[in-house]
Amino acid sequence: MGRARDAILDALENLTAEELKKFKLKLLSVPLREGYGRIPRGALLSMDALDLTDKLVSFYLETYGAELTANVLRDMGLQEMAGQLQAATHQGSGAAPAGIQAPPQSAAKPGLHFIDQHRAALIARVTNVEWLLDALYGKVLTDEQYQAVRAEPTNPSKMRKLFSFTPAWNWTCKDLLLQALRESQSYLVEDLERS
C-alpha cells in the first residue's frame, strides 16, 4: 500500500506550474468511471502536488487514482511520464531495492508510512542529508542514486531527489530511512510524530 500514491506524487511533483494547472483543468473534464465523483473545482485549483495526490487517492483510491492520473498525463502529451507512472504502480512486491527483502503481503502495514505522511515537512526541514545518504548507501540506495542526490545543490532539492526513488521502496526500506532520521535529527522526528 502507498506505492501508487508515491508514484502519483512523484509524477505530479515533476510537472511545471503550468503543467500542474493544465492537469487540474483536464481533471475537471476527464471521463470518470461509473460510481466516482469529481473533485470540486474550487478545492482542486488551489491545491499543490501533495494535496492533489491526497485528494486523488481519497476520491478514487490508489489503483484507479493512478490510472486516472496516467490518462490525464497522456491527454496532456506527457506520454513517457504516463508510462512511468503505470510502470511504477504496477510493480509487484518483488521490487525491493538492493538487498532488502520485501515483507510478505499478509504482513503489509495499514495506512501511510511516516516517511510518506511527512514528505513535505521532511523535504523542507531535513538538514543532515549527507548523513542519511551514508546510512542508506548499499542498503536502499545504489551508487548512482547516492551520487544523484549528492549532486543536488540544496538540502530541499537533495531530499526531493531522494524521495524520487521512494516509489519503488517497500515498508522495510522506508523504515531504514526513518531509523536514519531518528539517529540524525531525532528532534525533527519527535516533532512530526506529535503533529
Epitope: 491527454d75 506520454q79 513517457e80 508510462g83 503505470q86 511504477a88 504496477h90 509487484g92
Partner: antibody
Framework: QIQLVQSGPELKKPGETVKISCKAS????????MNWVKQAPGKGLKRMGW????????TYSDDFKGRFAFSLETSASTAYLQINNLKNDDTATYFC???????????WGQGTTLTVSS | DIQMTQSPASLSATVGETVTITCRAS??????LAWYQQKQGKSPQLLVH???TLVEGVPSRFSGSGSGTQFSLKINSLEPEDFGNYYC?????????FGGGTKLEIK
C-alpha cells in the same frame, strides 16, 4: 485492434536518403509515443529513439544523432524515419514500435528492410 | 547507461523440455523489465512487462521473475512455436536498453 503498418523494402545507394513510414490504427495516435528500432542482419535489437506523437518532439539515442530524423503526419496517424547520407552499415530491418502501457513496446510494425549497396 | 546482459546467447532444447533464460542489469532496475519473442523473419512480440506480468494472450507456460539486477524467463514444456529469439529490455524510461538476445533452437 492495434496495428502498425510500415512501408515496403528499400534498395538504396550510399549517400542517398530514405524515408520509412509507419501508419498506426486501432488507437488514439497522439496518446502513445512511437519508437524506432534497428536490427542489422543476424543481430539484436537496437533502439534508435522515439518521437512524442502529441508534441512532435523527437529524442535520439546516442548512436543515432545526426543523420537520422523522426517526424509525424498526425492527421494520417503516421510516423516517419528518415536516414540521410546512407552508409553500408545502415543495411538493416527497421521497426516502429508503440511506447505503450508502462513504457513497454507493446505493438510493433512488420519491419522495413533497407539495403544500402553500391 | 544501463546495460542488459542475457545468457545464454544460444540454447538448444527439445519439445516438451523446460528452459530458463536469464538477464542481468548493470544496476538496480527494480522490476522494470520486459521480455520479447521474435520468430525468424517476424517482428518482436511483447511477452512480459514489469518482470512478471504476462501480456494478455501469451500462453501460461511462459513466466517471468526477478527484481533488482537478476531476471529470468521460464518456458515450461516447450512447444514447436516457441523456438526463436528472446530479448529482455529495461522499460521504465530512456535508454530502454535491450539485452543481446538468446537464440532458442530445436535440438
Amino acid at each position: 485492434q492495434i496495428q502498425l503498418v510500415q512501408s515496403g523494402p528499400e534498395l538504396k545507394k550510399p549517400g542517398e536518403t530514405v524515408k520509412i513510414s509507419c501508419k498506426a490504427s486501432g488507437y488514439t495516435f497522439t496518446k502513445y509515443g512511437m519508437n524506432w528500432v534497428k536490427q542489422a542482419p543476424g543481430k539484436g535489437l537496437k533502439r534508435m529513439g522515439w518521437i512524442n506523437t502529441y508534441t512532435g518532439e523527437p529524442t535520439y539515442s546516442d548512436d543515432f544523432k545526426g543523420r537520422f530524423a523522426f517526424s509525424l503526419e498526425t492527421s494520417a496517424s503516421t510516423a516517419y524515419l528518415q536516414i540521410n547520407n546512407l552508409k553500408n552499415d545502415d543495411t538493416a530491418t527497421y521497426f516502429c514500435a508503440r511506447l505503450g502501457y508502462a513504457n513497454s513496446f507493446d505493438s510493433w510494425g512488420q519491419g522495413t528492410t533497407l539495403t544500402v549497396s553500391s | 547507461d544501463i546495460q542488459m546482459t542475457q545468457s545464454p546467447a544460444s540454447l538448444s532444447a527439445t519439445v516438451g523440455e523446460t528452459v530458463t533464460i536469464t538477464c542481468r542489469a548493470s544496476e538496480n532496475i527494480y522490476t522494470y523489465l520486459a521480455w520479447y519473442q521474435q520468430k525468424q523473419g517476424k517482428s518482436p512480440q511483447l511477452l512480459v512487462h514489469n518482470a512478471n506480468t504476462l501480456v494478455e494472450g501469451v500462453p501460461s507456460r511462459f513466466s517471468g521473475s526477478g527484481s533488482g539486477t537478476q531476471f529470468s524467463l521460464k518456458i515450461n514444456s516447450l512447444e514447436p512455436e516457441d523456438f526463436g529469439n528472446y530479448y529482455c529490455q529495461y522499460h521504465y524510461g530512456s535508454p530502454y536498453t535491450f539485452g543481446g538476445g538468446t537464440k532458442l533452437e530445436i535440438k
